[in-house]
Amino acid sequence: MAVTACQGLGFVVSLIGIAGIIAATCMDQWSTQDLYNNPVTAVFNYQGLWRSCVRESSGFTECRGYFTLLGLPAMLQAVRALMIVGIVLGAIGLLVSIFALKCIRIGSMEDSAKANMTLTSGIMFIVSGLCAIAGVSVFANMLVTNFWMSTANMYTGMGGMVQTVQTRYTFGAALFVGWVAGGLTLIGGVMMCIACRGLAPEETNYKAVSYHASGHSVAYKPGGFKASTGFGSNTKNKKIYDGGARTEDEVQSYPSKHDYV
């Protein structure tokens, strides 16, 4: 019951997180005009990953997309890539985790398969959350750097008589949405991984296999081994299962860290 709750909660938390990552990626307010210590203007500038907007005090808002790909800063492209990778991984993770949910029955899917899928989706959520946090953090770092550069320009670039309003940008709402959403996705992923441990059956009962010794009819029922979930040390136990001898490595394969690069 606790496992189902942990898995379900992990799924819901990740779902909210991924929705937040999508929202943050689409939002226009990644950076907003800094109003502190600036001349008060009748226009308000803000920028997103895909377009920049100007809201006039009169109520009119005009947004223009970045219609160039090569002319954009490499950092912005990197942030876009991180966010998109986060969304894609998160979406795949959601799809996998739906089938992995203990409360949903799909054919005769084994608990071990569900455990695998839960772990896979958990890792995907973790990577997705990290991508979002990394993307938002890179953008925030870019803003901080530009902010101090433009602040320096404000005080050094006034040699002439004509003053220019230096528009400085600070953190927009999308950054906070992105950080929170990335964190939620990460937490959801961890919960899925935790749920995976409890999903794999503690005791696996196998069909009785008769061993006929000469002269005696002795039926031997082997005791069940603990099923490995990849967290235990018992990964090389050989078992007779339905008449076929296989190692657990062949029965269950787990994603390595290289699967998600």
């Epitope: 203007t41 009748a42 005090s57």
Partner: antibody, heavy 117, light 113 residues
């Protein structure tokens, strides 16, 4: 269509307060702002202040201590109040609606105010 | 406050003549966000309310004849009437619509020769 109409007292004694009402139609005060401009006889235009759709206000720095602008969205009215009047406050007072580029695209016909004892 | 300087203060012109007037601001009116200059031109005929001619320094308001052209960027702006008409006799004001307070220039009066 968009219309703005100012109504004022016409004559005000020095040191008294001036109250002018601008009644608008054809647009919502919740969305759009209203600016106030005055013009002393034979002189140029002087921007007084503005109240935007969100209720925020900005005033001319020389008048900030004695000018206030407020509005009643439900009645579609904007109110200008100028305290401690002097003779050089004699002017025609206009209310106008800012549009694209914050430019005032619609103007009232103006109300003439004379400050005299 | 931004100071808006208009020149000349008055101009005597003849019908059909090309008219140019200038407006200078003490600070740049160019917004980096959309690369637009928040400078507006108004026309005021005697006994009338001002009328919007041009906003964003060069965008004509609908209904304004195309003989009126606004140009310039940053701090220097120009209003040009390509062919002066009798009905264009008025005072022309420029206004800063960017930084508060939204100050006006003193105006340029057009008179007929």
């Amino acid at each position: 269509q968009v219309q703005l109409k100012e109504s004022g007292p016409g004559l005000v004694a020095p040191s008294q307060s001036l109250s002018i009402t601008c009644t608008v139609s054809g647009f919502a005060l919740t969305t759009y702002g209203v600016s106030w401009v005055r013009q002393p006889p034979g002189k140029g235009l002087e921007w007084l202040g503005v109240i935007w759709g969100d209720g925020s206000t900005h005033y001319h720095s020389a008048l900030i201590s004695r000018l206030s602008i407020r509005k009643d969205n439900s009645k579609s009215q904007v109110f200008l109040k100028l305290n401690s009047l002097q003779t050089d406050d004699t002017a025609t007072y206009y209310c106008a609606k800012p549009g694209r580029g914050n430019a005032m695209d619609y103007w009232g016909q103006g109300t003439s105010v004379t400050v005299s004892s | 406050d931004i100071v808006m300087s208009q020149s000349p203060s008055s101009l005597t012109v003849t019908a059909g003549e090309k008219v140019t007037m200038s407006c200078k601001s003490s600070q740049s009116l160019l917004n980096s966000g959309n690369q637009k200059n928040y400078l507006t031109w108004y026309q005021q005929k005697p006994g009338q309310s001002p009328k919007l001619l041009i906003y964003w320094a060069s965008t004509r308001e609908s209904g304004v004849p195309d003989r009126f052209t606004g140009s310039g960027s940053g701090t220097d702006f120009t209003l040009t009437i390509s062919s002066m008409q009798a009905e264009d006799l008025a005072v022309y004001y420029c206004q800063n619509d960017y930084i508060y307070p939204l100050t006006f220039g003193a105006g340029t009066m057009l008179e007929l020769k």
